[in-house]
Amino acid sequence: FERTRSLQDPCSNCPAGTFCDNNRNQICSPCPPNSFSSAGGQRTCDICRQCKGVFRTRKECSSTSNAECDCTPGFHCLGAGCSMCEQDCKQGQELTKKGCKDCCFGTFNDQKRGICRPWTNCSLDGKSVLVNGTKERDVVCGPSPADLSPGASSVTPPAPAREPGHSPQ
């Protein structure tokens, strides 16, 4: 075991937060400020991510882990690890090259990000529109027209209100 260990790369003993320093006989040296090593055995440390401008710091860099950024209010993260910040829009809008634009008729967006999506086509499921769509909300589909024939309703009517102290007839 000792023989195997001595044949190993001496750098493999350097823990996270250090680098294997070739200038100092491969001893483990601490990462400089504003840098980190998240795994052992590294020959250099990595520069900490800096959250500047529209990015703000969600988690500070440490000697063993990179900083994590999110976006300032009015923006949201895009991409792996919040690599980009994109402007928020209002519900009922989408972001275009010219800024936030209202959803076209027949489309909606119920979030501050993303694109306007077409209203659900109730008739494709053989249903009717129960509540009309808006720029911010999708349509609500109700029962199919066939279900609304006299005497057959799949929409349960509300129970009649009773006055206190009266028993049902």
């Epitope: 200038n23 400089p32 400020p33 840098s35 250099t44 990595d46 520069i47």
Partner: nanobody, 122 residues
Framework: EVQLLESGGGLVQPGGSLRLSCAAS????????VGWVRQAPGKGLEWVSA????????YYAESVKGRFTISRDNAKNTLYLQMSSLRAEDTAVYYC???????????????RGQGTQVTVSS
């Protein structure tokens, strides 16, 4: 060739002060990220302080914040570490260090000097 020559160490009583100097040659301290590391007896190297982003920010280890001050004299190409309220745990060899940024994105540091011994004892 990069050279770093530390001086100013010595024996001081707890609560006392010292100013360490690092005379640099082969590079310009005002244009690079530079600092101080130390090695206490039987321990590994520890970062103490640094001037980063070409002077835009400074770093201090938690253990020295409020007691140590890093500065530099561009005309003399010299880095300083003013140490006050010294404690026994500050006893170490102090090395001047130049942070090196490699083309591939890696970061290391150089300590070319012999260091200067600081001993805090009554």
């Amino acid at each position: 060739e990069v050279q770093l020559l530390e001086s100013g160490g010595g024996l001081v009583q707890p609560g006392g002060s010292l100013r360490l100097s690092c005379a640099a040659s082969g590079f310009t301290v005002s244009a690079e990220d530079v600092g101080w590391v130390r090695q206490a007896p039987g321990k590994g190297l520890e970062w103490v302080s640094a001037i980063l982003d070409s002077g835009g920010s400074t770093y201090y280890a938690e253990s020295v914040k409020g007691r140590f001050t890093i500065s530099r004299d561009n005309a003399k190409n010299t880095l300083y570490l003013q140490m006050s309220s010294l404690r026994a745990e500050d006893t170490a060899v102090y090395y001047c260090a130049r942070i090196v940024y490699h083309a591939g994105g890696g970061v290391t540091f150089d300590t070319r000097g012999q260091g200067t011994q600081v001993t805090v004892s009554s």
